[in-house]
């Protein structure tokens, strides 16, 4: 009776187990009762990094110099190209799809150390009593407003992203 599951590096098609194509190769035709799976190597600037049944290889990533990118590691038929940023610039993500001179600190974080030519911005979370409501590459966390010194009371508590809201004291008549 036909198989319902296949071994590792095989796939089920037409009630038959066929070999997957090895990394660096794409599927041309499925196996039959009489023939093996037919695979072809990926072309120049293409790759497949897993055992697969893909009919098309993936294009290597392009490291766009207009975005500040350059090739860190050239792709092969089995691996994608790895991009990095020009010296002194920083990737915006692990995938390194674009470059920034230095990162900024999001709301809720303040700048602990401003970026230099050799180090990126260092951010720190705003502790209790401090806040930052902006993205910045130079601003520290700011202390909450002291309502008491203005003879006011706290109407709304502060957070790491918002200042306290002060209001008038309730006067007893």
């Amino acid at each position: 009776e036909p198989p319902t599951a296949c071994r590792e590096k095989q796939y089920l098609i037409n009630s038959q187990c066929c070999s997957l194509c090895q990394p660096g190769q794409k599927l041309v035709s499925d196996c039959t009762e009489f023939t093996e799976t037919e695979c072809l190597p990926c072309g120049e600037s293409e790759f497949l990094d897993t055992w697969n049944r893909e009919t098309h290889c993936h294009q290597h990533k392009y490291c766009d110099p207009n975005l500040g990118l350059r090739v860190q590691q050239k792709g092969t038929s089995e691996t994608d190209t790895i991009c990095t940023c020009e010296e002194g610039w920083h990737c915006t993500s692990e995938a390194c799809e674009s470059c920034v001179l230095h990162r900024s600190c999001s709301p809720g974080f303040g700048v602990k150390q401003i970026a230099t030519g050799v180090s990126d911005t260092i951010c720190e979370p705003c502790p209790v009593g401090f806040f930052s409501n902006v993205s910045s590459a130079f601003e520290k966390c700011h202390p909450w407003t002291s309502c008491e010194t203005k003879d006011l009371v706290v109407q709304q508590a502060g957070t790491n992203k918002t200042d306290v809201v002060c209001g008038p004291q309730d006067r007893l008549r």
Epitope: L67, G68, C85, T92, V100, L101, R103, A137, F138
Partner: nanobody, 116 residues
Framework: EVQLLESGGGLVQPGGSLRLSCAAS???????EMWWVRQAPGKGLERVS?????????YYADSVKGRFTISRDNSKNTLYLQMNSLRAEDTAVYYC?????????WGQGTLVTVSS
Amino acid sequence: EVQLLESGGGLVQPGGSLRLSCAASGFTFRDYEMWWVRQAPGKGLERVSAINPQGTRTYYADSVKGRFTISRDNSKNTLYLQMNSLRAEDTAVYYCAKLPFYFSEWGQGTLVTVSS
């Protein structure tokens, strides 16, 4: 498309002054922190000065503190850098930049040469 056009550079004698301008377009200028960054010949990029969106808070590198003043006019979408008491070591190409400093959003810069 973000565009930043720096101007105002030139040749000036030590002790002299210059005012750089940066005309911004393609984004809501008043919403962004802005920076002046410079690159001296054969050197890396140096962060010179920054200003928050409202123009109420500023940052200056130690090397320019007390000599340079950053300002902005949000109604004119323009950033400024007033440079006084210029020194030979201020010679550089000056760029303005907006958060978050994407490589693709930089202008051509303006060259400042301080020499007698």
